[in-house]
């Protein structure tokens, strides 16, 4: 698992729609793999965290002034859709094949 | 200023190229406004932090399981270029009008 000391990476995050109160309109699935981006953005930033120039700059400034400037943050840089069965306005069960931006495809340092 | 208790926002971050060791190839400017994204991504996520669906989900899961799942992170969501004067391979001072991704244009919760 990606602890605080580990590098930025994608980790498992199973989300149950009942837990977040979305079961009132999402019929299925009951839960899904959302993933989570966890870990630190440490110097030097590796290519696999696809750092922007700003993230590189911020990392270097943090290295010099750690109390003044924070590190870059490990966040989703690419998201994937999931398919959901939901109730429309008329209460009709409807399948949405691509419910965008629900699951992490890639993590990076930003 | 945006402390830990404040909401995600863009704050000033003046970067001196000498401080980060880039003065060896960037001739001018000597420093620039990079900005930094600071503050928390608290529930409910406001429209101005342009949250993705995943960020909304993660925020809701964090609300229910704060020790298991982290909050979404306040990061640059749009970057701007700056202009820099640098030396090319022949040592000729050359202006790059659009050195992309160097300054924060917008922050958001991801």
């Amino acid at each position: 698992s990606a602890g605080a000391g580990s590098h930025c990476q994608k980790t498992s995050l199973r989300v149950n729609f009942e837990d977040i109160g979305w079961d009132s309109w999402i019929i299925a699935p009951k839960e899904y793999e959302a993933y989570e981006c966890k870990g630190g953005c440490f110097f030097p930033l590796a290519d696999d965290v696809t750092p922007t120039k700003h993230a590189i700059v911020q990392t270097l400034v943090h290295l010099k002034f750690p109390t003044k400037v924070g590190k870059a943050c490990c966040v989703p840089t690419k998201l994937s859709p999931i398919s959901v069965l939901y109730k429309d306005d008329m209460g009709v069960p409807t399948l949405k094949y691509h419910y965008e931006g629900m699951s992490v495809a890639e993590c990076g340092c930003r | 200023s945006a402390g830990a208790g404040s909401h995600c926002q863009k704050t000033s971050l003046r970067v001196n190229f000498e401080d980060i060791g880039w003065d060896s190839w960037i001739i001018a400017p000597k420093e620039y406004e990079a900005y930094e994204c600071k503050g928390g991504c608290f529930f409910p996520l406001a429209d101005d932090v342009t949250p993705t669906k995943h960020a909304i989900v993660q925020t809701l899961v964090h609300l229910k399981f704060p020790t298991k799942v982290g909050k979404a992170c306040c990061v640059p969501t749009k970057l701007s270029p700056i202009s820099v004067l640098y030396k090319d391979d022949m040592g000729v001072p050359t202006l790059k009008y659009h050195y992309e991704g160097m300054s924060v244009a917008e922050c958001g919760c991801r």
């Epitope: - | 001018a28 050359t94 202006l95």
Partner: antibody
Framework: EVQLVESRGGLVQPGGSMRLSCAAS????????MNWVRQAPGKGLEWVAH??????????HYAESVRGRFTISRDDSKSSVYLQMNSLKTEDTGIYYC??????????WGQGTLVTVSS | DIVMTQSPDSLAVSLGERATINCRAS??????????MNWFQQKPGQPPKLLIY???NQGSGVPDRFSGSGSGTDFTLTISPLQAEDVAVYFC?????????FGQGTKLEIK
């Protein structure tokens, strides 16, 4: 070693034409803006024209004093730049320098060639 | 066009002393935090040579006795200590806007 060698200038009558050429070596010619800068006898320096890169569609710019009369061109395959001068005036007399550089500075200079416009 | 005006037109300084040449632009030649100001040296019978670029940076192979300063509209070239081989005409030049323009030149001689 960077070298810019201008063709020989000479004497031309007012209203006449002359073509200058400049052969470059010692640097990647196609990566640099090329310019002509002139200097009237005992006077200061005056930028005449420049031509940018292929990626800029070889855009050209001219000093107001020569616009419509002078044409700058380049041949990257020959590492050469040219200045076609038409409708020459006595005030065009001077040393013409071929210069190469960036979008910021005149970095490389030729030795110059003297153009004299006189009847 | 941006007009560059140098002062003085000529200058005589003793060997080992400091020579100061000023250049004023008709409008600011700064943009993006960069000064679009260069200095050239021209010795008799030779083409100009880049001395200082971006107001304060030395060109390749330029001795440390040459320094530049200034921003906006007012710039200075300083030569210290002056040596015999520094006898030349010095030109300031802006590259902020086309047409790129030069100052009229300052002739430096030994007193």
């Amino acid at each position: 070693e960077v070298q810019l060698v201008e063709s020989r200038g000479g004497l031309v009558q007012p209203g006449g034409s002359m073509r200058l050429s400049c052969a470059a070596s010692g640097f990647t010619f196609s990566n640099y803006w090329m310019n002509w800068v002139r200097q009237a006898p005992g006077k200061g320096l005056e930028w005449v024209a420049h031509i940018r890169l292929k990626s800029d569609n070889y855009a050209t710019h001219y000093a107001e004093s020569v616009r419509g009369r002078f044409t700058i061109s380049r041949d990257d395959s020959k590492s050469s730049v040219y200045l076609q001068m038409n409708s020459l005036k006595t005030e065009d007399t001077g040393i013409y320098y071929c210069t190469g550089g960036s979008n910021y500075v005149f970095a490389f200079w030729g030795q110059g060639t003297l153009v004299t416009v006189s009847s | 066009d941006i007009v560059m005006t140098q002062s003085p037109d000529s200058l005589a300084v003793s060997l080992g002393e400091r020579a100061t040449i000023n250049c004023r632009a008709s409008e600011s030649v700064d943009n993006y935090g960069i000064s679009f100001m260069n200095w050239f040296q021209q010795k008799p019978g030779q083409p100009p040579k880049l001395l200082i670029y971006a107001a304060s940076n030395q060109g390749s192979g330029v001795p440390d006795r040459f320094s530049g300063s200034g921003s906006g509209t007012d710039f200075t070239l300083t030569i210290s200590p002056l040596q015999a081989e520094d006898v030349a005409v010095y030109f300031c030049q802006q590259s902020k806007e086309v047409p790129w323009t030069f100052g009229q030149g300052t002739k430096l001689e030994i007193k």
